[in-house]
Amino acid sequence: QESLSCDASGVCDGRSRSFTSIPSGLTAAMKSLDLSFNKITYIGHGDLRACANLQVLILKSSRINTIEGDAFYSLGSLEHLDLSDNHLSSLSSSWFGPLSSLKYLNLMGNPYQTLGVTSLFPNLTNLQTLRIGNVETFSEIRRIDFAGLTSLNELEIKALSLRNYQSQSLKSIRDIHHLTLHLSESAFLLEIFADILSSVRYLELRDTNLARFQFSPLPVDEVSSPMKKLAFRGSVLTDESFNELLKLLRYILELSEVEFDDCTLNGLGDFNPSESDVVSELGKVETVTIRRLHIPQFYLFYDLSTVYSLLEKVKRITVENSKVFLVPCSFSQHLKSLEFLDLSENLMVEEYLKNSACKGAWPSLQTLVLSQNHLRSMQKTGEILLTLKNLTSLDISRNTFHPMPDSCQWPEKMRFLNLSSTGIRVVKTCIPQTLEVLDVSNNNLDSFSLFLPRLQELYISRNKLKTLPDASLFPVLLVMKIRENAVSTFSKDQLGSFPKLETLEAGDNHFVCSCELLSFTMETPALAQILVDWPDSYLCDSPPRLHGHRLQDARPSVLECHQ
């Protein structure tokens, strides 16, 4: 049997050591003990007695099925306890009585049906994070379960086989910053929602089939809910249940962010928010994020005209990797307050983009992200976006563009352009001179000779440049990142010719460690202030005897350098 390995600060690692019991020889010097992925099965009352100063105890996936009632009695300093993914079919309040310093407790993934006969947590007054439940057996949440807990930063409950929720069970916790609920269906959702309205700031609902969700008025008095964010992950919705969910918003008037991640919509987008009050109550929602939305019949999807009015005040919208090929012109015109739009990883082409960015579309838009779509012509894309009078930032990275022409038109306020991973081989005057930030990283550029008088930041890593670009091209440059090119050297003159340069990242290039380069790096200790990735990323490529040495450590041969 292997032994623990401990460092000088008392952090001990015993993961995956085939322990069949808590190892002997534990001491008060130990601050952290990780015994995950073992086959311990049993923790006796004296096994941890010596660990009086232990702050972290991790026993994840160690096949534990029995813990004696007083096994943790000496762990008064313990702040972090992870008992997840073990075989504990029942939980005992006596384990937690002595753990008055505990801040983090993970009991998830054990096969208990309830949290125990009596309240587990009354003494855990410092608890900040609690994770409970499992996929298959945890079936009941009761009023006694959270007694004693008044405030939590994070509460995660995996109740995917929930059969009974006792009303007001979660109400006793007065303040929960982030509640994650794994519920397989919506049966108890309204009851739970009523109980957490006045306490939860961020509610995340996971893996829930909401297809049959039906709203009914909540039995609550006028509450001022602190909820700012609502997220659905891995959930299933229909057009009808979406309408029903919208009705919950009347209870969370401070909501500012809604997120749908990896959800499925078994519908056509035929939403009909029937009640006009819903529209006004969406008033404070500023951010809507949708990622990986799966719509089996996306080719029959409606134009969303029924929800135009819902989104008039929204400032940030992300719809990522969801087969978007068109935002109808009339929809774009309704998004009057929109400042940020991210349509990454979709199916946009110039022809449909033209309809989306029609006259009057997105009048307040400042940032547009069209990364990884099906755009081909930089010239057409720029021209189409001329309608966006307030656009300052455009990301069209990860599109495969045809070679760029000599001249293009762009929105006049544009200051930031991301052309990374677009396969470009040459930069031409198509790129606007108004730019302050340009990203052309991960392309096939072997030179850069474009005058950009206002450019403050240039990102040109992962290309094929052999030298730093000429400083006269960028008179006000502050930041240049040119990692992973074929740059062989840089000199005092080169760096000195960038009058305002504050940050240079030039590591992982093919440096020829010549006498000049090594002399310069030895004589210039201030390099560390400008080269942010110095010294570890600056290695000699040649001569062979110095290959792999850091420039900082490499010493030129006296013979070579003083001939």
Partner: nanobody
Framework: EVQLVESGGGLVQAGGSLRLSCAAS????????MSWFRQAPGKEREFVAV????????DYSTSVKGRFTIFRDNAKNTVYLETTSLELEDTAVYYC???????????????WGQGTPVTVSS
């Protein structure tokens, strides 16, 4: 109505691996949550693993976590269970199940296969 057919079971030595497959008929496969359960001789049927509609969420029973992997290919209407580091206690008939709800509770699954036997020998 979805029909499920499991395959890939067999005799394997302790420490070995098997890939179990479950082929589904019907065009609505991607709408189903898919699960694997198992039943050892003389014991109750127990949950093994579950995967959601898209494959974005997976969960495992404690006894197989870290050793088994569930994944699905919606284009092929198939869900798989990759089993590694097999132990004697893994000997059972393995069933795949399809349902509307992401859960480890067998009662919530409407469609079941006929099972494929896995025998782990020392």
């Amino acid at each position: 109505e979805v029909q499920l057919v499991e395959s890939g079971g067999g005799l394997v030595q302790a420490g070995g691996s098997l890939r179990l497959s479950c082929a589904a008929s019907g065009r609505t496969f991607s709408r189903y949550v898919m699960s694997w359960f198992r039943q050892a001789p003389g014991k109750e049927r127990e949950f093994v693993a579950v995967i959601n509609w898209s494959g974005g969420s997976t969960d495992y029973s404690t006894s197989v976590k870290g050793r088994f992997t569930i994944f699905r290919d919606n284009a092929k209407n198939t869900v798989y269970l990759e089993t590694t580091s097999l132990e004697l206690e893994d000997t059972a008939v393995y069933y795949c199940a399809a349902g509307e709800y992401y859960t480890g509770a067998s009662s919530r699954y409407d469609h079941w296969g006929q099972g494929t036997p896995v025998t782990v020998s020392s």
